[in-house]
Interface confidence: low
């Protein structure tokens, strides 16, 4: 540009561009100065004067340099699945998590928009894959001389334990009964757990002005090219 | 310009399988949810299933097994496979864009609609 | 499986009345509601979004209501163009659904 062209708005050289933080109107056909972020603009700009800017109103954000006429709506407050980890402000939308023990099971590019609890695997069958912020549990039937006989979405198939004498041979939802001599080999007490996932995906919830109840899961998990893990139930 | 345009439909008989394709002009269909709705001779609209960003297809309840949604990125197309057709089936079939508004790449409407595609099913 | 009901099925107007159509979900979908209008032949044409929200190039006689399980749509001065079959569609959930859309008001000159 020519060093004396400095304010907006200017009419910009054939085949340039506006500079950093400067678009170029089309009715004006002149770069104007965009708004900073928790602004947006008020009055465009013509030929003689530059955009005016104004300030987000409450529940309203603009997040990057911009020439909206209206702040964008943040999300409706976050619903009961989820937990809130970024305030609505005058620059950036509100953000919710999904909850421990919620996946995020349908997602957008900047987010979340439905989260869903982790599938529980019944008695007889284990976590095969744990669940992650974005991806649900996966169970198995637990494999001979493996048990599960809790329903949870943590808990893996764990070895019978081994008796000098069986009282009670094991299956697969059911640990070995031994007769009252004590058995060789056992787990440590408890059932095994792993570790729950921390949900870090933001959600951009629905912009309504009621927060949302959280769905029935039931509801949420895609139809992929596979059917759900054979033991899973909804909750 | 945004435009939409279905083809592939047609007269088949009962127990086949055809192909609807929707081509996609003026934006990158990979960006948007894509769906596929129905409507059959004097009937009203009937949702067939969706596409997300990401790739995943969701379907009708009645659609499950029978219907697939894809989508080619390099050829900017969307795709429904139907198979085991029924007379049930017949309808014209409309692809349509999520609007994705407001820098949001999910709205839960459509906006724009092909002009669709007849398909008849029938011996 | 979440279930859209409109009321009525069609209804007879005159032009300038005023008309207003609802829509029920069978839960709640807080605003994620649209509205379409449909004419003979034609692909159905987005009128209303996020339950309230008009449409770019929709004229401001169409208006929508409403938030988690009722809705409506009001046409507040009914015009010649707007004899047509009018939807609602919920785009809040779509898994384990039979059908997103409700099953259509036709409007109809008296």
């Known amino acids: 540009l020519p060093a004396q062209v400095a304010f907006t708005p200017y009419a910009p050289e054939p085949g340039s561009t506006c500079r950093l933080r400067e678009y170029y109107d089309q009715t004006a056909q002149m770069c104007c100065s965009k708004c900073s972020p928790g602004q947006h603009a008020k009055v465009f700009c013509t030929k003689t004067s530059d955009t005016v800017c104004d300030s987000c109103e409450d529940s309203t954000y603009t997040q990057l340099w911009n020439w909206v006429p209206e702040c964008l709506s943040c999300g409706s407050r976050c619903s009961s699945d989820q937990v809130e980890t970024q305030a609505c402000t005058r620059e950036q939308n509100r953000i919710c998590t999904c909850r421990p023990g919620w996946y995020c099971a349908l997602s957008k590019q900047e987010g979340c928009r439905l989260c869903a609890p982790l599938r529980k695997c019944r008695p007889g069958f284990g976590v095969a894959r744990p669940g992650t912020e974005t991806s649900d549990v996966v169970c198995k039937p637990c494999a001979p001389g493996t048990f599960s006989n809790t329903t949870s979405s943590t808990d893996i198939c764990r070895p019978h334990q081994i008796c000098n004498v069986v009282a009670i041979p094991g299956n697969a939802s059911m640990d070995a009964v031994c007769t009252s001599t004590s058995p060789t080999r056992s787990m440590a007490p408890g059932a095994v757990h792993l570790p729950q996932p921390v949900s870090t995906r933001s959600q951009h919830t629905q912009p309504t002005p009621e927060p949302s109840t959280a769905p029935s899961t039931s509801f949420l998990l895609p139809m992929g090219p596979s059917p759900p893990a054979e033991g899973s139930t909804g909750d | 310009e945004v435009q939409l345009v279905e083809s592939g439909g047609g007269l088949v008989q009962p127990g086949g399988s055809l192909r609807l394709s929707c081509a996609a002009s003026?934006?990158?269909?990979?960006?948007?949810?894509m769906t596929w709705v129905r409507q059959a001779p004097g009937k009203g609209l009937e949702w067939v299933g969706i596409?997300?960003?990401?790739?995943?297809?969701y379907y009708a309840t009645w659609a499950k097994g029978r219907f697939t949604i894809s989508r080619d990125n390099s050829k900017n197309t969307l795709y429904l496979q139907m198979n085991s057709l029924r007379a049930e089936d017949t309808a014209v079939y409309y692809c349509?864009?999520?609007?994705?508004?407001?820098?949001?790449?999910?709205?839960?409407?459509?906006?724009?609609w092909g002009q669709g595609t007849l398909v008849t099913v029938s011996s | 499986d979440i279930q859209m009901t409109q009321s009525p099925s069609s209804v007879s107007a005159s032009v300038g009345d005023r008309v207003t159509i609802t829509c029920q979900a069978s839960?709640?979908?807080?605003?994620?509601l649209a509205w379409y209008q449909q004419k003979p032949g034609k692909a159905p044409k987005l009128l209303i979004y996020?339950?309230?929200k008009l449409a770019s190039g929709v004229p401001s006689r169409f208006s929508g209501s409403g938030s988690g399980t009722d809705f409506t749509l009001t046409i507040s001065s009914l015009q010649p163009e707007d004899f047509a079959t009018y939807y609602c569609?919920?785009?809040?959930?779509?898994?384990?659904?039979?059908?997103?859309f409700g099953g259509g008001t036709k409007v109809e000159i008296k």
């Open positions: 349509a864009r999520d609007t994705g508004y407001g820098g949001y790449d999910y709205a839960g409407s459509f906006d724009p």
């Open positions: 003026g934006f990158s269909l990979s960006d948007y949810f």
């Open positions: 596409i997300n960003t990401g790739g995943d297809s």
């Open positions: 839960e709640n979908i807080n605003s994620w």
């Open positions: 996020e339950a309230s």
């Open positions: 569609q919920q785009g809040y959930i779509y898994i384990d659904v039979g059908n997103i």
